[in-house]
């Protein structure tokens, strides 16, 4: 029978006797930076080439006994998870291994850097097809390791890394914290976060998604036909590296941004029990478990978007937080969130020729998050239209006035500390979907985009009585690009997108009272691209 | 011991070929920064990655490394260049005393310096 982990990542339509065709991932080369490996193990024989690269520190302790099978254990298992003939994800992928971890599973940042440089030089000397680099290791936050990962990613290499096994914020570790790297947390057969002794999988905004990482059957270095079960975020990352190899083999031209968006899009949503994570990390941690796409082609027509959270701004009066999209992505909307509710909104602004999302803390606030909605929108031309605070009681409004531009997101930002708590809510005049409306003391920012075949619509869900959370979702075939609250009153903690649902959070109802002030409306902007759909149909 | 002699020889050569003082002082207003692992047990003091500014060429990286060795030797410190980076990041890996960090941060082309640290199988 199929091991639980392979079944979990396999869409139902694939599930037959045989998990996958034997050549899945055959156009892709996966580099593994790990321990030494037993490359003649029957599970990986002929699939893994051991390079002559080795950069490891000496083992600790004078009494350490170097036993080959122990030295090879971690790397052999991971190579098997990626491409093993029986228990591998991408059975056709070829691999190259670099030894950067010693027999105790320990390496150095510098050794890893030299390994990444070796990969880049190999790529330049002999360009092959798509490359995936698996980094099943973690150390403390390292600026230089993150920078090297960024450079390699910008050279077209897909990097996949373990989130870390420290039951901690992945942003405190490298390469997990590098934005260009696909960072993977671990879940078990019950889709719960993996506990490892007193610790467990890392979590937080630096994790892109989770994947099976407990009781994973794979090649054992104890003998050439042995199998063993291992657990950890390394195993989870190996699954995603295998899935990435499968996807790149089917569509070799996929960019890193496209691959990441597809990984997120095809993941199982909302299956992880978030109670395992610390309360302050739940909203930041993606509730996604990786899976193979239901079919290798035909995803191109979709408008893909993902949510990117900033680091926390910190509590100072003028503190701000910035969320950025990847280079090939468009920022289609910007929202903000504060647990205390004390914030001064958010705005989209240009930084280095690219739009970023900046959130502003308020006096007495514990800090804010900026939340960017980052989308793949080819040939897009987006701009931000701003309306300063209006003096009229009707509130501030701004719309997309350029021909062919559609509204993809609304943001509001205010300088006053308290945004008119006692003023009645401002409601959007009906029949004006291309318009952002906000509080009269706030400046309003509309994200307006022109792209072939792009169409968007506004969807609202209002609740008259106070409620901690109001949601509105885009229907099938439409993608959530914008998420905001109407009105921008003080008891709203903020708004953010979770998959295709816009979530507006309010202060605890017990402290709000049930006046009209409690009314909250969640506003979603849902878009689709007819152009992408047509292009896809023509291909098929 | 052989290694150390080799290093010393290299240093003498570097001393002879290097002009005195800082020929290329760092650009005004840009200060290189020092980074180290926040998790103390994972730190590896004594080995440092010197990262140079983005457009630095390999020859400049080598020259900067040699300059560091020469200036360190003048102060009575032995250093060893373990690796010169190029292809991903310009810079070099150096084994040296932490006492030399202030000196190294003032070298031309230096963007930042990071103390080496451990990584672990997950």
């Amino acid at each position: 029978s199929i091991p639980w982990n392979l079944e979990r990542i396999t869409p139902p339509r694939y599930r037959a006797d045989e998990y996958q065709p034997p050549d899945g991932g055959s156009l892709v080369e996966v580099y593994l930076l790990d321990t030494s490996i037993q490359s003649d193990h029957r599970e990986i024989e002929g699939r893994v080439m051991v390079t002559d690269f080795e950069n490891v520190p000496e083992e600790d302790g004078t009494r350490f006994h170097r036993q080959a099978s122990k030295c090879d254990s971690h790397g052999t298992h991971l190579a098997g998870v990626v491409s093993g003939r029986d228990a591998g994800v991408a059975k056709g992928a070829s691999m190259r291994s670099l030894r950067v971890l010693n027999c105790q599973g320990k390496g150095t940042v510098s050794g890893t850097l030299i390994g990444l440089e070796f990969i880049r030089k190999s790529q330049l000397v002999q360009p092959v097809g798509p490359l995936v680099v698996l980094l099943p290791l973690a150390g403390g936050y390292s600026r230089v390791l993150n920078a090297a990962c960024q450079r390699l990613a910008r050279a077209g290499v897909v990097l996949v890394t373990a989130a870390g096994n420290f039951r901690d914020d992945a942003c405190l570790y490298s390469p997990a914290s590098a934005p260009e790297v696909i960072t993977v947390g671990a879940t078990n057969a019950q889709d719960q976060p993996v506990t490892l002794g007193t610790l467990g999988t890392n979590f937080g905004r630096c994790v892109d998604l989770f994947a099976p990482g407990e009781d994973i059957i794979g090649a054992s270095s104890d003998c050439s036909t042995c199998f063993v079960s291992q657990s950890g975020t390394s195993q989870a990352a190996a699954h995603v590296a295998g899935i990435a190899a499968m996807m790149l083999s089917a569509e070799p031209e996929l960019t890193l941004a496209e691959l990441r968006q597809r990984l997120i899009h095809f993941s199982a949503k909302d299956v992880i029990n978030e109670a395992w994570f610390p309360e302050d990390q739940r909203v930041l941690t993606p509730n996604l478990v990786a899976a193979l796409p239901p079919s290798t082609h035909g995803a191109g027509w979709q408008l893909f978007c993902r949510t990117v959270w900033s680091a926390h701004s910190g509590p100072t009066r003028m503190a701000t937080a910035v969320a950025r999209c990847a280079p090939d992505e468009e920022l289609l909307s910007c929202s903000s969130f504060s647990r205390s509710g004390k914030r001064r909104g958010e705005r989209m602004e240009a930084q280095g020729g690219k739009l970023v999302c900046r959130a502003h803390n308020a006096f007495g606030g514990e800090g804010v998050y900026a939340i960017a909605r980052c989308c793949l929108l080819p040939q897009a031309n987006c701009s931000v239209h701003t309306a300063p605070p209006a003096e009229a009681s009707m509130g501030t409004r701004v719309h997309c006035h350029q021909q062919g531009h559609v509204l993809t997101g609304c943001s509001s930002h205010w300088e006053v500390e308290d945004l008119g708590t006692h003023k009645p809510p401002v409601l959007r005049p009906r029949g004006q979907p291309n318009q952002c409306v906000g509080h009269r003391e706030a400046s309003i920012h509309a994200s307006c985009c022109h792209a072939p075949g792009l169409e968007c619509k506004v969807k609202e869900h209002g609740i008259p009585a106070p409620q901690e959370q109001v949601t509105v979702a885009c229907e099938e075939g439409w993608t959530l690009t914008g998420c905001s609250a109407l009105p921008g009153t003080s008891h709203v903690l903020g708004a953010y997108a979770v998959d295709n649902t816009c979530v507006v959070r309010s202060r605890d109802v017990s402290t709000t009272g049930s006046t009209s002030e409690g009314a909250v409306t969640a506003v979603a902007i849902c878009c689709r691209s007819r152009h992408l759909a047509q292009a896809s149909q023509e291909l098929q | 011991q052989e290694d150390e002699d080799g290093d010393y020889e290299e240093l003498v050569l570097a001393l002879r070929s290097e002009e005195d003082g800082l020929a290329e002082a760092p650009e005004h207003g840009t200060t290189a920064t020092f980074h180290r692992c926040a998790k103390d047990p994972w730190r590896l003091p004594g080995t440092y990655v010197v990262v140079l500014k983005e457009e630095t060429h390999l020859s400049q990286s080598e020259r900067t490394a040699r300059r560091l060795q020469a200036q360190a030797a003048r102060r009575g410190y032995l250093t060893k260049i373990l690796h010169v980076f190029h292809g991903l990041l310009p810079g070099f890996l150096v084994k040296m005393s932490g006492d030399l960090l202030e000196l190294a941060l003032k070298l031309p082309h230096v963007d930042y310096i990071e103390e080496d640290s451990s990584v672990f199988a997950q």
Partner: antibody, heavy 115, light 107 residues
Framework: QVQLVQSGAEVKKPGASVKVSCKAS????????ISWVRQAPGQGLEWMGW????????NYAQKLQGRGTMTTDPSTSTAYMELRSLRSDDTAVYYC????????WGQGTTVTVSS | DIQMTQSPSSLSASVGDRVTITCRAS??????LDWYQQKPGKAPKLLIY???TRPSGVPSRFSGSGSGTDFTLTISSLQPEDFATYYC?????????FGQGTKVEIK
């Protein structure tokens, strides 16, 4: 190119031992072990076992346990198969092949056991 | 051990004929089946691995199919150099086991 070259034919008496060698070239030996397969005259193929260049690990067919020993010498890229206490039904052509996949074969070594 | 049964044990055919050889496993071997060609006095040569994959250098007239317990090797248009003995081999379990062979002779 990738090839396996075996030692020459052997004639042995019953009860004796034979050691057949197989020299690998043209590929990274550590990435594959060596399988040994034999074929008695006019018969089919029989897998005897596998040996690793990487760490010397072995995997023997049950029928061979105790009588056969497979070893490797990575320094010369050579694998060896020794068969002891030879019997007349050990008369066969002995082949080495690359790995469990057996995608490359040696030319074969004829071992004749006759009194 | 898994038993492999080939049929027919021999067949006569002419150049240009389409030839089919079947192989049955005593239990499911998924798609872990290889086919070898052996000419008199020569070592076997891998023709097909994993039921249907042709290694580079093997002519396209050779094809393999099947999964589970029943497998087929097809030579779409028999050539003079194809007269040989063909063996199937399961690669699912250790020890690997071979079929008894199918001899393809000139009619």
């Amino acid at each position: 190119q990738v090839q396996l070259v075996q030692s020459g034919a052997e004639v042995k008496k019953p009860g004796a031992s034979v050691k057949v060698s197989c020299k690998a070239s043209g590929y990274a030996i550590y990435n594959y072990g060596i399988s040994w397969v034999r074929q008695a005259p006019g018969q089919g193929l029989e897998w005897m076992g596998w040996v690793s260049f990487y760490n010397g690990n072995t995997n023997y067919a049950q029928k061979l346990q105790g009588r056969g020993t497979m070893t490797t010498d990575p320094s010369t890229s050579t694998a060896y198969m020794e068969l002891r206490s030879l019997r007349s039904d050990d008369t066969a052509v002995y082949y080495c092949a690359r790995g469990y996949v057996m995608d490359i074969w040696g030319q074969g070594t004829t071992v004749t056991v006759s009194s | 051990d898994i038993q492999m049964t080939q049929s027919p044990s021999s067949l006569s055919a002419s150049v240009g004929d389409r030839v089919t050889i079947t192989c049955r496993a005593s239990q499911s071997i998924n798609n872990w089946l290889d086919w070898y060609q052996q000419k008199p006095g020569k070592a076997p040569k891998l023709l097909i691995y994993a039921a249907s994959t042709r290694p580079s250098g093997v002519p396209s007239r050779f094809s393999g199919s099947g999964s589970g317990t029943d497998f087929t090797l097809t030579i779409s248009s028999l050539q003079p150099e194809d007269f040989a003995t063909y063996y199937c081999q399961q690669d699912q379990d250790i020890p690997p086991t071979f079929g008894q062979g199918t001899k393809v002779e000139i009619k």
